[in-house]
Interface confidence: low
């Protein structure tokens, strides 16, 4: 499973990560695939 | 406008000790994760530390070359970052970049600074 | 550690043509994958993101493609500026690991 700060739950209400984030219920995205250095 | 600048590095001996600093401007520092990436002459590029944002408890992560050797830390009021580097070895020569990152979820902001050398020779 | 191998080492192509770079994972990274171009003297800038999203302000001759272990850069017309070194990264699993980089020369 992914284990780096890129998995880590973003706090930006109502985002959707263009590189295939899930909006959960509460609204807030999750960052997936898409960290940079 | 956005800037990173690296400072502290120069020459040292092996088994000595320095500090990296790196300062940023023209964006919110606080919200940033940062990482330092080092590239030896001619080499090519390599993580070494990483330290999340301030939200995320400034957790850190290293390369298993530096554990227990390098210090990475921030000061988010100073806008400011830092790489405590001790027993330094011949194989940390290199250039020295600190870059951040910072996801707002339709997009990305990845910014560099231009580096700072590091030389570990007697 | 996942290891990145880039190919090729390097490739010589002349203004115009299509650029193909690989990149291949020892392990699944999904796609966290990101390309960087590094010119002489001048630290790395960042091309894409997340496998195929291209950073503000690249342009789109620039695109990713890939997923799980094998990735590919494509340069679809080059232009003078983009001869430079590649490097491939993933950020799926610490320790974050780049590629060896390929050098795109001018033929």
């Known amino acids: 499973a992914c284990d780096t700060a890129t998995c880590v739950t973003h706090r930006l209400a109502g985002l959707l990560s263009r590189s295939g984030g899930v909006v959960k219920n509460n609204f807030v995205p999750t960052n997936v695939g898409s960290k940079a250095f | 406008e956005v800037q990173l600048v690296e400072s502290g590095g120069g020459l040292v001996q092996p088994g000595g000790s320095l500090r990296l600093s790196c300062a940023a401007s023209?964006?919110?520092?606080?919200?940033?994760?940062i990482s330092w990436v080092r590239q030896a002459p001619g080499k090519g590029l390599e993580w070494v530390a990483e330290?999340?944002?301030?939200?995320?408890?400034?957790?850190?992560h290293y390369a298993e070359a530096v554990k227990g050797r390098f210090t990475i830390s921030r000061d988010n009021a100073k806008n400011s970052l830092y790489l405590q580097m001790n027993s330094l070895r011949a194989e940390d020569t290199a250039v020295y970049y600190c870059?951040?990152?910072?996801?707002?979820?339709?997009?990305?902001?990845?910014?560099w600074g231009q580096g700072t050398l590091v030389t570990v020779s007697s | 550690e996942i290891v990145l191998t880039q190919s090729p080492a390097t490739l010589s192509l002349s203004p115009g043509e299509r650029a193909t770079l690989s990149c291949k994972a020892s392990?699944?990274?999904?796609?966290?994958v990101s390309w960087y171009q590094q010119k002489p003297g001048q630290a790395p800038r960042l091309l894409i993101y997340?496998?195929?999203n291209r950073y503000l302000g690249i342009p789109a001759r620039f695109s990713g493609s890939g997923s799980g272990t094998d990735f590919t850069l494509t340069i679809s017309s080059l232009e003078p500026e983009d001869f430079a070194v590649y490097y491939c990264?993933?950020?799926?699993?610490?320790?974050?690991?780049f590629g060896q980089g390929t050098k795109l020369e001018i033929k």
């Open positions: 870059t951040s990152y910072f996801d707002y979820g339709l997009a990305i902001q990845n910014y």
């Open positions: 023209g964006f919110t520092f606080s919200n940033y994760w």
């Open positions: 330290i999340r944002s301030e939200s995320d408890a400034s957790a850190t």
């Open positions: 392990k699944r990274v999904t796609t966290y």
């Open positions: 997340g496998a195929s």
């Open positions: 990264s993933q950020s799926y699993n610490y320790p974050y690991t």
